[in-house]
């Protein structure tokens, strides 16, 4: 149910998505059971996720990883959720860690990560991961989303 | 604060209930510092939030459990996010997965699943877990609830 | 973007602060990327969150922290997400509870709270864990906020 | 999915060597980590040795210094080098396929038998 028209509901949930890209960043899609409320939230490059309105957005992101201490660096899987402003440098909002379990061939951990921030409009937010090879891509592992206040 | 009769507040937050039923499904209760806004939203059967109105939902779920590596499965412990909308199959919204502890007897672990998705008149969501046996229910650990946008 | 004066916004996300306190309650500064909308709701003390207004909060946390097996107790690591209504008892709204790491010097590990509750005026929410010493606070890794619904 | 084909096993005295191989084909190799692992009589399959896409190795404590796993991606095909060997090494040998975020594989070879006997 939209709000009316000057206040449209914006809210969008997106889906994991396997890349053959070596980049940090991680890769979303627009399918199984996604949402994209309008187009005052859109999914740009696979990316990120860009708001056309400034205000007050609930950001959050899940990443369930499968790893091994002994097959990865000492450092911990950290996943970060950041945020790209027009005509700004990009910069942390919340990150989580989880130590590399014992378990053989890997044991599944998940990350979740939410928090309230001010975006302007044209503002990007998206997920760094230390190590996306180790993300799990099975159906409900790995998603990211907002809501407008 | 009701947003006005025509919009009001929809929200819940539904507290875990240990049950020697053997299903997957986890059990709650309105009890303790439980949040059941009005009748938009209702707890079924103890075990699914059930919404009368469509719309986008802020749908979470907390789940401690405690297991040892030794003692169970090889399969990590996993906490799924279910949907089911009247006259469709079950589907998967969102899953976490832990590997289980190598402490002894058991060691505690938390998870936390939380995601925007459109709910239609009538749909339920409910939680299911791996080994319902490990679910810790001490005051505050295990709960589950949802907001409308 | 206010909802009108009758009823604006109300969200805060307040970033983690070392302290020389030895208490279990965490501290929290407005820095960094946080966020307090206005003066209805408030950061009393560094260490609880205060609203002026009755209604549906969505209320959380994360923490990261960095523990050791050996080094520890045999307990967990326990974050509670606790409430202080005026003229109340303090009450836990809720918890989660990691196992510490058998990674040497520590492994780190986040935990991630949230859930939706209703507020008196006056009343204040406040985070407590089993050994602050323990949590990390580099950028982005542990935060605590609110929305009013 | 990944249709892979072992072979290399049979008999062997204990103290010998044998080494298995893994022919991979379908999908890609390269996103795809490639192990072995082992299911003795009456036992549970275990997990012996696997090799992520950056040639990062992992070993099961009972097998470690060992075995050597190793890899040749031109030919889409994955070693397991098997020294100094032990009866109780005896098991079907499976080689498997997994992707970096799955606990389990997700593709499996019709195993080669080993065994390790005097």
């Known amino acids: 149910m939209q709000k009316g028209d000057q206040n449209p509901q914006i809210a969008a949930h997106v889906i994991s998505e396997a890349s053959s890209k070596t980049t940090s960043v991680l890769q979303w899609a627009e399918k199984g059971y996604y949402t994209m409320s309008n187009n005052l939230v859109t999914l740009e490059n696979g990316k990120q996720l860009t708001v056309k309105r400034q205000g007050l957005y609930y950001i959050y992101a899940q990443v369930t990883f499968c790893s091994n201490r002994e097959a990865s660096s000492q450092a911990p899987f950290i996943a970060s959720l950041c945020l790209k402003s027009p005509g700004r440098f990009e910069r942390i909002l919340l990150r989580a860690a989880n130590t590399h379990s014992s378990a053989k061939p890997c044991g599944q951990q998940s990350i979740h990560l939410g928090g309230v921030f001010e975006l302007q409009p044209g503002a990007s937010v998206f997920v760094n991961v230390t190590d996306p090879s180790q993300v799990s891509h099975g159906t409900g592992f790995t998603s990211f989303g907002l809501l407008k206040l | 604060m009701q947003k006005g009769d025509q919009n009001p507040q929809i929200a819940a937050h539904v507290i875990s209930e240990a049950s020697s039923k053997t299903t997957s499904v986890l059990q709650w209760a309105e009890k303790g510092y439980y949040t059941m806004s009005n009748n938009l939203v209702t707890l079924e059967n103890g075990k699914q939030l059930t919404v009368k109105r469509q719309g986008l939902y802020y749908i979470y779920a907390q789940v401690t459990f405690c297991s040892n590596r030794e003692a169970s499965s090889q399969a990590p412990f996993i906490a799924s996010l279910c949907l089911k909308s009247p006259g469709r199959f079950e589907r998967i919204l969102l899953r976490a997965a832990n590997t289980h502890s190598s402490a002894k007897p058991c060691g505690q672990q938390s998870i936390h699943l939380g995601g925007v998705f459109e709910l239609q008149p009538g749909a339920s969501v409910f939680v299911n877990v791996t080994d319902p046996s490990q679910v810790s229910h001490g005051t505050g650990f295990t709960s589950f609830g949802l907001l409308k946008l | 973007m206010q909802k009108g004066d009758q009823n604006p916004q109300i969200a805060a996300h307040v970033i983690s602060e070392a302290s020389s306190k030895t208490t279990s309650v965490l501290q929290w500064a407005e820095k960094g990327y946080y966020t307090m909308s206005n003066n209805l709701v408030t950061l009393e003390n560094g260490k609880q969150l205060t609203v002026k207004r009755q209604g549906l909060y969505y209320i959380y946390a994360q923490v990261t922290f960095c523990s050791n097996r050996e080094a520890s107790s045999q307990a967990p690591f326990i974050a509670s997400l606790c409430l202080k209504s005026p003229g109340r008892f303090e009450r836990i709204l809720l918890r989660a509870a990691n196992t510490h790491s058998s990674a040497k010097p520590c492994g780190q590990q986040s935990i991630h709270l949230g859930g939706v509750f209703e507020l008196q005026p006056g009343a204040s929410v406040f985070v407590n864990v089993t050994d602050p010493s323990q949590v990390s606070h580099g950028t982005g890794f542990t935060s605590f906020g609110l929305l009013k619904l | 999915e990944v249709q892979l084909v072992e072979s290399g096993g049979g008999l062997v005295q204990p103290g010998g060597s044998l080494r298995l191989s893994c022919a991979a084909s379908g999908r890609t190799f390269s996103p795809y980590i490639m192990g072995w692992f082992r299911q003795a009589p009456g036992k549970e399959r275990e997990f012996v040795a696997e090799?992520?896409?950056?040639?990062?190795?992992l070993y099961a404590d009972s097998v470690k210094g060992r075995f050597t796993i190793s890899a040749d991606n031109s030919k889409n095909t994955a070693y397991l080098q098997m020294n100094s060997l032990k009866p109780e090494d005896t098991a079907v040998y499976y080689c498997?396929?997994?992707?970096?975020?799955?606990?389990?594989?997700?593709?499996w070879g019709q195993g080669t038998l080993v065994t390790v006997s005097s």
């Open positions: 498997a396929a997994r992707r970096g975020g799955d606990y389990l594989p997700t593709d």
């Open positions: 090799i992520g896409w950056r040639d990062t190795t």
